[in-house]
């Protein structure tokens, strides 16, 4: 019968969420260990009745209206480990009378986010918390951190300060936190990190500030543990000096104003010529650094949405562990990775939405690359084996370029064309919007693609045998918006084809699928189909799940197969109610309303629907 009382009780967990409670109930089980009172209208927290529940380990008081904490309100809760007071009104003066939260001897996580707390006030609120591991002060109104902000928290490991208005962090503000490993300072108003010295820190989020420079402290023997650094959405002009951070695995520098230098640094050490755009590229580590090869452990680097025009050869040299590199939305005109062993571990390279005209990939560079994103560039005359050289390439997106595919080995095609045959690892290829005029025979021979998108190439001519060799592998084929009047592709031979998009062409006939195939989705929108005869579509009945037909001049009569699907078939015809057909009289009606008796001999109709 406990389901009929407002709070839900299971084992020693009690949930009293969003019940409009004005006070803590006095009638909960005395051995309750987890109590969720979030989303109520509690205004004050008193020692009675809260102190009745001495077994509490988890207490959630978030999203209430708490502005008063009775001194010693949590004193009786000697087992309390997790306390959330997030999204209340603790900044109101009454919350802080006589000692704030008081000592919290066993609390390991404390959430005070969203309380409009401001600097100075926080120090009065936080009491002694010797076991505290995790503290959230996010979404408050803190403007500065001092040496006194975080005292009596020797065990603190994770500190979340995101979404405050921090402008100033006093030297030594984190000195009393020797175990701090995770620090989130995102969404603040910091402008400069001039002396980063938190050696034990492993994760640092500085995203969404106004940081113009990031500099580590000049401690030659320092062993920085930082593995994860997020500096996205700042105002960095240069690649930051990270030579002192040899353990970095993840680095996000997207959405800054970074430009990489165009020539070698003027300074012999290579780390101090900011006028040239150098703020220490990962070229040389300071002497005494344990690693000696800065960024050699980096796995993920995001430099998207910057102002990079050129990648110097030396920039990629030490990134020997890099798996993911995002350079999209920059100003690159050329990209080169020609050196043997260049970026040997790279699996994903995103160069999309730049201004790339040339791309030079060495025969044995990028040996692990699986995904190459090049959409939204200006690639035109590439060396023919640009992609054939990439031994592990599985996914290639070339949408919005001007790439012309060569034919098969027997029909190489014009100069400047790119070979897509013989790339045995390639599975997905997008050639959308490349102004391709002719797809030559054998273009994809010995390239077992499962997905091929050739859409938005108006005037495309698909030569006989252009898709030859894909019959046993292709699962998704898109030819949308090409103005095709005839399809020179023997579709029924593509036994694995699951999704076929032929929308926005001028097709009026399909080949006959007489035997069962795998096709599940067929998009024929905005073509010139008047009839879909059962003789052609019969083989699709067992597999087809979805058929798109809007925008075709369908005939009301002679479409028996289609009518059957609309009424009781397994095929889901999209927008059935809006599917319009025409009688010979040119009268338009909804196809779903047509009855067999409406179609008389000769296709005439003299009955008013």
């Amino acid at each position: 019968h406990q389901d009929k009382v407002p709070c839900k009780m299971v084992d020693k967990k009690v949930s009293c969420q969003v019940l409009g409670l004005l006070q803590v109930p006095s009638v909960l089980p005395p051995d309750t260990e987890t109590l969720d009172l979030s989303g109520n209208q509690l205004r004050s927290i008193l020692a009675s009745p809260l102190g009745f529940y001495t077994a509490l380990r988890h207490l959630d008081l978030s999203t209430n209206e708490i502005s008063f904490l009775q001194p010693g309100a949590f004193q009786a809760l000697t087992h309390l480990e997790h306390l959330s007071l997030a999204h209340n009104r603790l900044a109101m003066a009454t919350a802080l009378s006589a000692g704030g939260l008081g000592p919290l001897p066993r609390v390991t996580s404390l959430d005070l986010s969203g309380n409009s707390l401001y600097s100075g006030l926080l120090e009065r609120l936080l009491g002694e918390a010797p076991s505290l591991h995790t503290l959230s002060l996010a979404e408050n109104s803190l403007t500065r951190l001092t040496r006194h902000t975080f005292r009596d928290m020797p065990a603190l490991e994770q500190l979340d300060l995101h979404s405050n208005v921090l402008m100033d962090i006093e030297d030594g503000a984190f000195e009393g936190l020797p175990r701090l490993t995770h620090l989130n300072l995102s969404r603040n108003s910091l402008t400069c990190i001039s002396d980063f010295s938190l050696q034990q820190l492993r994760v640092l989020d500085l995203s969404c500030n106004s940081i113009e420079a990031f500099q580590t402290a000049s401690q030659p023997q320092a062993e920085f543990q930082l593995t994860w650094l997020d500096l996205r959405e700042n105002k960095l002009l240069h690649f930051p000096d990270l030579a002192a951070l040899p353990r970095l695995i993840y680095l996000n520098l997207s959405n800054n104003l970074i430009r990489l230098p165009t020539g070698p640094p003027q300074d012999s050490k290579g780390i101090h010529a900011p006028s040239e755009g150098w703020s220490a590229l990962p070229l040389s580590a300071p002497s005494g650094n344990a690693s000696g090869r800065p960024l050699s452990q980096l796995l993920n680097l995001d430099l998207s949405y910057n102002e990079i025009e050129l990648i110097p050869d030396s920039f990629l040299e030490h990134l020997t562990s890099l798996c993911f590199l995002n350079l999209s939305r920059n100003c690159l005109r050329t990209f080169e990775a020609r050196r043997l062993g260049s970026l040997p571990c790279l699996m994903l390279l995103d160069l999309s939405h730049n201004a790339l005209e040339t791309l030079e990939l060495g025969a044995r560079a990028l040996g692990s690359l699986r995904t190459l994103l090049l959409q939204g560039n200006a690639l035109r005359d590439l060396p023919p084996y640009t992609f054939a050289n990439l031994a592990s390439l599985q996914r290639l997106n070339l949408q919005g370029n001007r790439v012309s595919p060569c034919g098969g080995p027997d029909e190489p095609g014009p100069s400047g064309c790119v070979a897509f045959s013989g790339i045995t690892s390639l599975r997905s290829l997008s050639l959308v919007d490349n102004e391709i005029e002719l797809l030559r025979a054998g273009a994809f021979l010995h390239t077992p693609l499962t997905e091929l998108d050739l859409s938005s190439n108006p005037g495309l001519e698909v030569a006989t045998g252009a898709l030859g060799g894909l019959e046993a592998s292709l699962e998704v084929l898109a030819l949308q918006g090409n103005g095709l009047m005839v399809l020179q592709v023997d579709l029924p031979c593509f036994i694995c084809l699951k999704r076929l998009n032929l929308a926005e062409n001028r097709l009026s006939h399909l080949p006959a699928w007489t035997q069962a195939v795998s096709l599940e989705v067929l998009d024929l929108r905005n073509n010139s189909f008047s009839l879909l005869p059962g003789s052609a579509m019969g083989g699709l009945e067992t597999s087809l799940r979805r058929l798109y037909l809007q925008g075709n001049p369908l005939s009301c009569c002679g479409n028996g197969w289609l009518a059957a699907q609309l009424h009781q078939g397994r095929v889901d015809v999209d927008a059935t109610q809006d599917l319009i057909c025409r009688f010979s009289s040119q009268e338009e009606v909804s196809l779903s309303h047509v009855r067999p008796e409406d179609c008389e001999k000769g296709g005439l109709k003299n009955i008013n629907l």
Epitope: V5, Q23, V27, P30, D31, S48, T54, A55
Partner: antibody
Framework: QVQLQQPGPELVKPGASVKLTCKAS????????MHWVKRGPGRGLEWIGR????????HYHEKFKTKVTLTVDKPSSTAYMEFSSLTSEDSAVYYC?????????WGQGTAVTVSS | DIQMTQTTSSLSASLGDRVTISCRAS??????LNWYQQKPDGTVELLIY???TLHSGVPSRFSGSGSGTDYSLTISNLEQEDIATYFC?????????FGSGTKLEII
């Protein structure tokens, strides 16, 4: 099934003390408050107080604070109410009752008579 | 302390009648109201808790309603075994307090 067993009547002299017992069975003893209620002759019911068996923490009605002490023995799942300095006013039937939202199971009550 | 008032100390009704017993709190008790039945032999049972929730095993002819400060217990079809004294109790705020009781008799 849930049972609260209280012993038979007690005859006590004025000024003396008495310790009433309530043995619980059939449920997790520490998951419910144990309440004590007085029914005086010709009177209604009066709430004396309650105790949390898991911690031994007790809450009393102001009226009984100096008169009554509530305790528990967890291993034997037994609750106790000790009365001190008894007077004739304390002659009544005393019930123990288990309960959180409501006192859903009651003992049969122990009649205490204070007489010289 | 919150005072609980049962204005009707005794009530007479016939078998089969619909009987309503009322209870008023001196302040809002947020539905934390229980009803108890004390039989002539002294045994006490919980009938309804949290204003309207029927305790297990209690016949469905008993029902409770109310909010704020005013609450009531209704017996829809009075039976012989319902002869007893009925007490309301608030458990919103310590100390928990009982009403003075309403004694139900058969005419």
């Amino acid at each position: 099934q849930v049972q609260l067993q209280q012993p038979g009547p007690e005859l006590v002299k004025p000024g003396a003390s008495v310790k009433l017992t309530c043995k619980a069975s059939g449920y997790i003893f520490t998951s419910y408050w144990m309440h004590w209620v007085k029914r005086g002759p010709g009177r209604g019911l009066e709430w004396i107080g309650r105790i949390a068996p898991n911690s031994g923490g007790a809450h009393y009605h102001e009226k009984f604070k100096t008169k009554v002490t509530l305790t528990v023995d967890k291993p034997s799942s037994t609750a106790y109410m000790e009365f001190s300095s008894l007077t004739s006013e304390d002659s009544a039937v005393y019930y123990c009752a288990r309960g959180n939202y409501g006192m859903d199971y009651w003992g049969q009550g122990t009649a205490v008579t204070v007489s010289s | 302390d919150i005072q609980m008032t049962q204005t009707t100390s005794s009530l007479s009704a016939s078998l089969g009648d619909r009987v309503t017993i009322s209870c008023r709190a001196s302040q809002d008790i947020s539905n934390y109201l229980n009803w108890y039945q004390q039989k002539p032999d002294g045994t006490v049972e919980l009938l309804i808790y949290y204003t309207s929730t029927l305790h297990s095993g209690v016949p469905s002819r008993f029902s409770g309603s109310g909010s704020g400060t005013d609450y009531s217990l209704t017996i829809s079809n009075l039976e012989q075994e319902d002869i007893a004294t009925y007490f309301c109790q608030q458990v919103n705020t310590l100390p928990f307090t009982f009403g003075s009781g309403t004694k139900l008799e058969i005419i």
